[in-house]
């Protein structure tokens, strides 16, 4: 049984996405804009001594000999997203000793490329998704998740790392993007905005959603995150948009109800194991996929992004709790922790379903659809 959560099943950018509201400045697509140095770095901040790389904090990278088969959340880079170009972030300031990549913030100095040169790469994340331009790839099969329904014990670590809230996942959560494309989940974290301001990292036709969840995975071809960073397909992130619905989402409440305990930057608590798949959309067959990067320094490329077409619904109160409870460094609220969208630079976003055909209410005129590349090869 799945907990009721996501009602929206129209293509992204449709119906309940809030398209009737005029988009704010920060909702405008910036995919065509060249990356700005002041944009907050990606969504994975590199592991320092204690913090792993970006997409929030990747589990700490441990020597292979130590607990060889056991991946830790710390082994993944922590990647955080910078705010919109128009609104530099004042939170998620990293000032701890250790790797240089731990010294970064959203929307201010130092410029991310100075923190990590990869942040100036050509194939960065997040991006603006335009369903009409996506290439339909029938070879993209439904995602397969195994072992995501965790028992209450052992408990899991929930941490405010200063740029997101991150849940460290235990060994045994397996995910397949397709035959021979197998991964292990390491951690999940969220990106959000502020009161009345959306904070998803990816956008759809320029529309920014209230929040976004990222589940970070390591390819089974690699034993450690540091080996996989920058390697094509070494890391994979499942991303889903969160938006407002009429009911409380009981799966998310198991995490959101604990945020007060970790309001202070660097604090952590333990939470009962839960059904991680219940935090994601129920439709694993309809998604967009492209190759990008961590959304926070080190901004390592080669990351396979899978963005669900279906959204997850949280109540207004839950979204408020998410955006208004945590504190970052320097007595600043942890808000607007997203990176500006980055240019595609010729990349083609693939879709597992015919997203470009009569699917987006925002489509104004017919466009030339991209052809599907050799997906799954």
């Amino acid at each position: 049984q799945r907990l009721p959560r996501m009602q929206e099943d129209s293509p992204l950018g449709g119906g309940s996405s809030g398209e009737d509201d005029p988009l704010g400045e920060e909702d405008l697509p910036s995919e065509e804009d060249s990356p700005r140095e002041e944009d907050p770095p990606g969504e994975e901040d590199l592991p320092g001594e204690e913090d792993l790389p970006g997409e929030e904090d990747l589990p700490e990278v441990k020597p292979k000999s130590e607990e060889e088969g056991s991946l830790k959340l710390e082994d993944l880079p922590t990647v955080e997203a910078p705010g919109d170009p128009q609104e530099p972030q004042n939170n998620a300031h990293r000032d701890k000793e250790g790797d240089d990549q731990s010294h970064w913030r959203y929307g201010g100095d130092p410029p991310w490329p100075r923190v990590s040169p990869a942040c100036a790469g050509r194939f960065q994340s997040p991006v603006d998704i335009r369903p009409q331009l996506a290439a339909f790839c029938p070879a993209l099969r439904p995602l397969e998740l195994l072992g995501f329904q965790l028992p209450p014990l052992p408990e899991l670590r929930l941490r405010n790392n200063g740029h997101s809230v991150q849940l460290t996942l235990p060994p045994g959560l397996e995910m397949a993007l397709g035959p021979g494309r197998e991964y292990r989940a390491l951690q999940l974290h969220l990106h959000w905005g502020a009161a009345g301001r959306p904070g998803s990292e990816h956008t759809v036709e320029g529309h920014r959603f209230p929040a976004e969840i990222h589940v970070v995975h390591l390819s089974t071809a690699f034993a450690r995150v540091d080996e996989a960073l920058g390697r094509p397909g070494g890391l994979a992130v499942l991303a889903a948009f969160l938006e407002e619905g009429p009911e409380e989402n009981s799966a998310y409440e198991q995490l959101l109800s604990r945020l007060e305990e970790i309001a202070e930057e660097g604090s952590e608590t333990q939470v009962p194991g839960l059904d991680i798949s219940a935090l994601l959309p129920s439709d694993f067959s309809r998604y967009f996929q492209y190759e990008g990067s961590l959304t926070t320094p080190p901004c390592a490329q080669g990351v396979i992004w899978t963005v669900f077409n279906q959204t997850v619904m949280l109540s207004a109160k839950q979204l408020h709790t998410l955006s208004d409870t945590l504190w970052g460094p320097g007595d600043s609220r942890l808000q607007l922790n997203f990176r500006a969208t980055q240019p595609l630079n010729g990349r083609v976003i693939e879709a597992s379903f015919p997203a470009g055909v009569d699917s987006s209410p925002r489509a104004a005129e017919p466009v030339q659809l991209n052809s599907c590349l050799a997906a799954g090869d």
Partner: antibody, heavy 124, light 107 residues
């Protein structure tokens, strides 16, 4: 044989304090989550607090009804569990049970060993 | 908090009967449910864990079933020593919550 023996109950005035103890034996104390559960006369059971095992850092967790007033702790060397109860109210009157919970190999919380209980009466 | 709705609150049955006690939970708890027996003047004792697993030393006439939000405890071939109050308890997340109890009496 696994044994849990509570002590420290008694009559106390509203606003007063008590410290309950639970002497344990027959198992590896540090491996287990330990709980306090109470039962007012003729009423249902109510979980109050637990303290995690060594692997989880001996951190506590409380129910909303006692958070800020009660403190759970453990003396690992003497294998004793404690419940410090402050600002007691008449509605805290109950039999208090020391209970063994999950351990490193458990996959959820159930209460497999219970002490005989100690009675707390809060009255003026 | 997860709410536990136990029914009936009391029931009377004859020796040798089969009786069923229900526990409805306010949200999906998978199989993370336990059943306890508390005889008059005694402490609670674990009967069933993980919805259907019999605890050590518990007679096989006690069986548990269910998952998600609906659970049942069945006692077959009722015996005099089964006179007690029975409680369900969720172990999915804290605060851990118990049902209000079902008092079983012999006719």
């Amino acid at each position: 044989e696994v044994k849990l023996v509570e002590s420290g109950g008694g009559l106390v005035q509203p606003g007063g304090s008590l410290r309950l103890s639970c002497a344990t034996s027959g198992f590896t104390f540090t491996d287990y989550y330990m709980h306090w559960v109470r039962q007012p006369p003729g009423m249902a059971l109510e979980w109050l607090a637990f303290i995690r095992n060594k692997a989880s850092g001996y951190t506590p967790q409380y129910s909303a009804s006692v958070k800020g007033r009660f403190t759970i702790s453990r003396d690992v060397s003497q294998t004793i569990l404690y419940l410090q109860m402050n600002t007691l109210r008449p509605e805290d009157s109950a039999t208090y049970y020391c209970v063994r919970g999950g351990h490193a190999g458990s996959n959820y919380w159930y209460f497999d060993v219970w002490g005989a209980g100690t009675t707390v009466t809060v009255s003026s | 908090d997860i709410q536990m709705n136990q029914s009936p609150s009391s029931l009377s049955a004859s020796l040798g009967d089969t009786i069923t006690i229900a526990c409805h939970v306010s949200q999906n708890i998978n199989v993370w449910l336990s059943w306890y027996q508390q005889k008059p003047g005694n402490i609670p004792k674990l009967l069933i864990y993980q919805a259907s697993n019999l605890h050590t030393g518990v007679p096989s006439r006690f069986t548990g079933s269910g998952s998600g939000t609906g659970f049942t405890l069945t006692i077959s071939s009722l015996q005099p020593e089964d006179i007690a109050t029975y409680y369900c308890q969720q172990g999915q997340s804290y605060p851990f919550t118990f049902g209000s109890g079902t008092k079983l009496e012999i006719k």
